[in-house]
């Protein structure tokens, strides 16, 4: 259940997709990836206030218990709900290969 | 890829399953759930240091970028990898019903 998409903290402050530009060196991939040389990494960043983009019942429970016991139970966390694939040209034992990674780029975000 | 399960922060400090006891009132369920009266809520709590229980490639990227840009990119977050179902006896328009919720109790945790 994707609950409210209205962010009570102000525009852009709540859980949403962000793009962070990263080089192969930044990612620690320079020794095994040939291409792309730079990745526009899409990731989920932002706060998860009460019922904002709650992924499921567990997220709703977490919100309730965080309100009651903030020192024990953390607030829900902004994480990918789905991913976009990414194709890398990578080094192999015999040379070079195209490989698809299905869990690399966040496509959509929710709170859990 | 489930990476290292050794917690460098000390025993019990890293992402793992915790149980939190909660009443129907705590959960805000008292008006629609009859049973159980109390729930042993299993949830994922703890830190996600570098490569600890990394759920996938995205989590590994997040770790690398958090190390480089801690003010921009948050560390991976401890969330459920899978769930246990839970059966609730709940009120309906016509009386009472058994309902299974598949996404209520965390069964296993990882960092993402």
């Amino acid at each position: 259940a994707r609950n409210g998409d209205h962010c009570p903290l102000g525009p852009g402050r709540c859980c949403r997709l962000h793009t962070v530009r990263a080089s192969l060196e930044d990612l620690g991939w320079a020794d095994w990836v040939l291409s792309p040389r730079e990745v526009q990494v899409t990731m989920c960043i932002g706060a998860c206030p009460s019922q904002f983009r709650a992924a499921n019942m567990h997220a709703q429970i977490k919100t309730s218990l965080h309100r009651l016991k903030p020192d024990t139970v953390p607030a829900p966390c902004c994480v990918p709900a789905s991913y976009n694939p990414m194709v890398l040209i990578q080094k192999t034992d015999t040379g070079v290969s195209l490989q698809t990674y299905d869990d690399l780029l966040a496509k959509d975000c929710h709170c859990i | 890829a489930r990476n290292g399960d050794h917690c460098p922060l000390g025993p019990g400090r890293c992402c793992r399953l915790h149980t939190v006891r909660a009443s129907l009132e705590d959960l805000g369920w008292a008006d629609w759930v009859l049973s159980p009266r109390e729930v042993q809520v299993t949830m994922c709590i703890g830190a996600c240091p570098s490569q600890f229980r990394a759920a996938n490639m995205h989590a590994q990227i997040k770790t690398s970028l958090h190390r480089l840009k801690p003010d921009t990119v948050p560390a991976p977050c401890c969330v459920p990898a899978s769930y246990n179902p839970m059966v609730l006896i709940q009120k309906t328009d016509t009386g009472v019903s058994l309902q299974t919720y598949d996404d209520l109790l965390a069964k296993d945790c990882h960092c993402i």
Partner: antibody
Framework: QQLKESGGRLVTPGTPLTLTCTVS????????MTWVRQVPGKGLEWIGI?????NTYYASWAKGRFTISKTSTTVDLKITSPTTEDTATYFC???????????????WGPGTLVTVSS | DVVMTQTASPVSAAVGGTVTINCQAS??????LAWFQQKPGQPPKLLIY???TLASGVPSRFSGSGSGTEFTLTISGLQCDDAATYFC????????????FGGGTEVVVK
């Protein structure tokens, strides 16, 4: 280490045709394979790649028109519904071509001619 | 879709001269580019890979340069045997992978 295409022949439009690239001297579980075609007297066209684990990648124009698959010793290219525009020599090659494999090898088959005509 | 645009044919030069062929990619393909030589009735022969690395057995008269979207093949000290058609190939990867050859450039040796 060798590649040899086969299966090229005269077909009528709409009749599916499968071309086979038979490899010897190396394992397909270690190498990506590329299919390329050349219309008589024209340029080269990149059709697609099957990687070492069997994932396929196609040129946008080739999606739906071709299917690449493999066994332990062969790589197949199926032309799903040939048209006269698919008349060409079809080549298989080892690797993704823009980078060389270790040992600097770049293997191509001699090609097989497909003629589509009614 | 990646599109490779290559110097128009034909290009001619005298024996001992220099020929330059350009190839432009519609996307940033980094160094995912190769150059091939093809003669009639034969499969293409790899000359340059990774934009600038000479393939084994290829004379050093052939050289490649460029990255991103602009690439060049240079043949210096032209010989009669260099008369052929030359193709660039680029591969673009991101959410998927796509490859394309340039249209080919015929080199005529005078």
């Amino acid at each position: 280490q060798q590649l040899k295409e086969s299966g090229g022949r005269l077909v009528t439009p709409g009749t599916p045709l499968t071309l086979t690239c038979t490899v010897s001297g190396f394992s397909l579980s270690s190498y990506d394979m590329t299919w390329v075609r050349q219309v008589p007297g024209k340029g080269l066209e990149w059709i697609g790649i099957i990687n070492n684990s069997g994932n396929t990648y196609y040129a946008s124009w080739a999606k739906g028109r071709f299917t690449i698959s493999k066994t332990s010793t062969t790589v197949d290219l199926k032309i799903t519904s040939p048209t006269t525009e698919d008349t060409a020599t079809y080549f298989c090659a080892r690797g993704i071509l823009v980078y060389a494999d270790y040992g600097d090898h770049n293997l191509w088959g001699p090609g097989t001619l497909v003629t589509v005509s009614s | 879709d990646v599109v490779m645009t290559q110097t128009a044919s034909p290009v001619s030069a005298a024996v001992g001269g220099t020929v330059t062929i350009n190839c432009q990619a519609s996307e940033d393909i980094y160094t995912n580019l190769a150059w091939f030589q093809q003669k009639p009735g034969q499969p293409p022969k790899l000359l340059i890979y990774a934009a600038s690395t000479l393939a084994s057995g290829v004379p050093s008269r052939f050289s490649g340069s460029g990255s991103g979207t602009e690439f060049t093949l240079t043949i210096s000290g032209l010989q009669c045997d260099d008369a052929a058609t030359y193709f660039c190939l680029g591969v673009y990867t991101y959410i998927s992978a796509d490859g394309a050859f340039g249209g080919g450039t015929e080199v005529v040796v005078k």
